[in-house]
């Protein structure tokens, strides 16, 4: 389980890297932070650090009341503050690990962590 | 209703240090960055430095950086600015400043407080 | 860094005057666009946000408009207290927040 943690931390941390220059990588994460309410890896301010972005600025999908927009010059208060490793972690040790291995499919080189299947299914409980 | 008072302003020669303090009230301090602006006598506004709701986010111009720290105290309602190294360009009058975020703008202002530094 | 450019840095005019201050963006800011007046002594004050939305407690002669790299603020009929010292500000990409370098408004 740890192993799969560490690799979900690497890999989401290394999409956040692709998240400006590949849409397909962004849509994932969007969907992630979105359905998971969380912002970044271990935190919001994980977003900061990318090379990229602004500082001043995170994916509209961290905010509370998504718009367009809304990521730009955000306030902590508009935002999620939680980092998503730990709560997408929590949720697949509690879902998914228990029950099957996690599906791995390609995603810009990288292994896919979470399947869209399980997001899904995420998204109507 | 929304107040920001500065204060610690002074004369200080260069490469003394000095520490303002910004004491808000009328609003809930925790839902707002907080700015420092200045403007050097006869000149325009400068942006200093800000800082996020908890504190987790810092940021300074270049032109202070390494200098000047900013930190709030969210328990006391404060904002402060901790100046080293002063230079004489530092000399203006510093504002304390709301900051809404998003595109709002910065909405209330302090009155400022005026640094000098000169031997 | 965004630069913020105002025009003219200086204007005369007289009481019930129509006037018209432009500040541009080195890159597009959409419309993350602010003005504020300031007058000799005093802290500055928030008039426009957001490009065009007036803030409360602001009259309806100020106004502001555009959006990318080109603004405007507009002040349809000045009046004696109007005469001042009006600042853009950009918050689309930070740090640095940057302003322009102000136009003073003086009495023809």
């Known amino acids: 389980r740890d192993k799969v943690m560490s690799e979900f931390n690497n890999n989401f941390r290394q999409q956040m890297e692709n998240y400006p220059k590949n849409n397909h990588t962004a849509s994932i994460l969007d969907r992630m932070q979105a359905d998971f309410k969380c912002c970044g890896a271990a935190n919001y301010t994980d977003w900061e650090k990318i090379p990229s972005m602004s500082k001043n600025r995170v994916p509209d999908s961290c905010c509370i009341n998504v718009t367009v927009g809304c990521g730009i010059n955000f306030n902590e208060k508009a935002i999620h503050k939680e980092g998503c490793v730990e709560k997408i972690g929590g949720w697949l040790r509690k879902n998914v690990l228990e029950q099957k291995l996690i599906s791995e499919e390609d995603l810009g080189g990288e292994q896919k962590l979470i399947s869209e299947e399980d997001l899904h299914h995420h998204h109507h409980h | 209703q929304v107040q920001l008072v500065e204060s610690g302003g002074g004369l200080v020669k260069p490469g003394g240090s000095l520490r303002l303090s910004c004491a808000a009230s009328?609003?809930?301090?925790?839902?707002?960055?907080m700015n420092w602006i200045r403007q050097a006598p006869g000149k325009g506004l400068e942006w200093v430095s800000y800082?996020?709701?908890?504190?987790?986010?810092?940021y300074q111009a270049d032109s202070v950086k390494g200098r000047f720290t900013i930190s709030r105290d969210n328990a006391k309602n404060s904002l402060y600015l901790q100046m080293n190294s002063l230079r004489a360009d530092d000399t203006a009058v510093y504002y304390c400043?709301?900051?809404?975020?998003?595109?709002?703008?910065?909405?209330?202002w302090g009155q400022g407080t005026l640094v000098t530094v000169s031997s | 860094d965004i630069q913020m450019t105002q025009s003219p840095s200086s204007l005369s005019a007289s009481v019930g005057d129509r006037v018209t201050i432009t500040c541009r963006a080195s890159?597009?800011?959409?419309?993350?666009l602010n003005w504020y007046q300031q007058k000799p002594g005093k802290a500055p004050r928030l008039l426009i946000y957001?490009?065009?939305s007036l803030q409360s407690g602001v009259p309806s002669r100020f106004s502001g408009g555009g959006s990318g790299t080109d603004f405007t603020l507009t002040i349809s009929s000045l009046q004696p207290e109007d005469f001042a010292t009006y600042y853009c500000?950009?918050?689309?990409?930070?740090?640095?927040?940057?302003f322009g370098q102000g136009t003073r408004l003086e009495i023809k």
């Open positions: 800082i996020s709701n908890s504190g987790a986010i810092k």
């Open positions: 890159q597009s800011i959409r419309n993350f």
């Open positions: 957001a490009a065009s």
């Open positions: 009328g609003f809930t301090f925790t839902d707002y960055f």
């Open positions: 400043v709301r900051d809404p975020r998003s595109y709002y703008g910065f909405d209330y």
């Open positions: 500000q950009q918050s689309y990409s930070n740090p640095p927040i940057t």
